[in-house]
Amino acid sequence: DITPSVPPASYHPKPWLGAQPATVVTPGVNVTLRCRAPQPAWRFGLFKPGEIAPLLFRDVSSELAEFFLEEVTPAQGGIYRCCYRRPDWGPGVWSQPSDVLELLVTEELPRPSLVALPGPVVGPGANVSLRCAGRLRNMSFVLYREGVAAPLQYRHSAQPWADFTLLGARAPGTYSCYYHTPSAPYVLSQRSEVLVISWEGEGPEARPASSAPGMQAPGPPPSDPGAQAPSLSSFRPRGLVLQPLLPQTQDSWDPAPPPSDPGV
């Protein structure tokens, strides 16, 4: 992608390229791409794939060059690399390119999936794991229960998914999840489809959030405190019916018993 001749790595090792405030931002944010060379350089170039010439130049006699992208638009997202060169190098000779930096400029991240593990039937004494899976690594994942504004559990994950464990006795209910960037400017995903976990005989269900009757999106708290969670008294204690996936468990952060549940 970078057309200037690139010498062997041993001659001019690659620089490091990073983004401030983050690599995932909302439109309108000012983004600074920082290219840091392992030695003082004379000229830095910022490259995008398919471009013959550098997108931007910075002539600085130091190890660091900053490229300012003001009020970024989605079109400015994509893959960036940077290189550096010194005046004593031959014409058109640049360092090895930095590792790829992918800048994503979006109002919201793609919808995650929410599935139950391991399924299909779990006894009342067993734990239930829900996996919220997005498309990006190093995100914070948040699990919600129907009618409750505050997150049920949350977990930062280096993987593009996070697993949440629910105690079997408290598992029945309707769940959804989101993921978001761990630092400002906070970019939030769309909400997952909701997942209904019920006792055997009532069947599992996943349905779009938009068509979920009675499903309250996390946000303003419910006006009726008694409606914060479904009553467990309406469920028959047999096995839980879940959607199957590979088993993987994590530690639980157990919610309070629902207001309608006097002592499970």
């Epitope: 914070s140 504004a149 559990q153 949350y154 906070y186 405190p225």
Partner: antibody, heavy 128, light 108 residues
Framework: EVQLVQSGAEVKKPGESLKISCKGS????????IVWVRQMPGKGLEWMGS????????RYSPSFQGQVTISADKSISTAYLQWSSLKASDTAMYYC?????????????????????WGQGTTVTVSS | EIVLTQSPGTLSLSPGERATLSCRAS???????LAWYQQKPGQAPRLLIY???SRATGIPDRFSGSGSGTDFTLTISRLEPEDFAVYYC?????????FGGGTKVEIK
């Protein structure tokens, strides 16, 4: 002035019940989680649980689930920690603290700040 | 749950010296969710650092935090008499929230 004021020291017998309080002032009570932290004599800090005062929805550490109940009354900006049957091992200092609620597009997400204001602590002594 | 291990358990230093406190996590913690607290005898903890490196309101600039992934550091560039206390790290990015066991900074 932003502050959390906790109820006074308590001396109880094993098996008795207890409810201690934490009153917030000088800020919007429903914009922050209230967090309860235990410190046993000579030991470190342990997170017990947190409550979202907006709808009194509580979250518990697995170690404290079923052992205590956390509640809140947003009309008087007060959170509570209660025991139905105390044990000698409940003897400790209990702190409340606040942690900012972060919202994006109306959705409460992972807390993004530490616990910036703490109560003065409530000493609970359980002894026969 | 994420286990935070602080070292050393006790640090004996003189006023004016530099203190370096370590906090190691059992699994990766986003730097956005790592805090440091100071606690003096008979007092409630006080927030020093949040987001691994951001100083809380009113905290002197001799306190600084750094690190990412599983290794985090609190540095006190020049110890003042009032800095001798116990310091705790805490992660709040994954439930349950957890604290480290603490490092006591005492006068040598």
């Amino acid at each position: 002035e932003v502050q959390l004021v906790q109820s006074g020291a308590e001396v109880k017998k094993p098996g008795e019940s207890l409810k201690i309080s934490c009153k917030g002032s000088g800020y919007s009570f429903t914009s922050y989680w209230i967090v309860w932290v235990r410190q046993m004599p000579g030991k470190g800090l342990e997170w017990m649980g947190s409550i979202y005062p907006g709808d009194s929805d509580a979250r518990y550490s697995p170690s404290f689930q079923g052992q205590v109940t956390i509640s809140a009354d947003k009309s008087i900006s007060t959170a509570y920690l209660q025991w139905s049957s105390l044990k000698a091992s409940d003897t400790a200092m209990y702190y409340c603290a606040r942690q900012k609620i972060t919202m994006v597009r109306g959705v409460i997400i992972t807390p993004l700040d530490g616990m910036d204001v703490w109560g003065q602590g409530t000493t609970v002594t359980v002894s026969s | 749950e994420i286990v935070l291990t602080q070292s050393p358990g006790t640090l004996s230093l003189s006023p004016g010296e530099r203190a370096t406190l370590s906090c190691r996590a059992s699994q990766s913690v986003s730097s956005s969710y790592l805090a440091w607290y100071q606690q003096k005898p008979g007092q409630a903890p006080r927030l020093l650092i949040y987001g691994a490196s951001s100083r809380a309101t009113g905290i002197p600039d001799r306190f600084s935090g750094s690190g990412s992934g599983t290794d985090f550091t609190l540095t006190i560039s020049r110890l003042e008499p009032e800095d001798f206390a116990v310091y705790y790290c805490q992660q709040y990015g994954s439930s349950p929230l957890t604290f480290g066991g603490g490092t006591k900074v005492e006068i040598k």
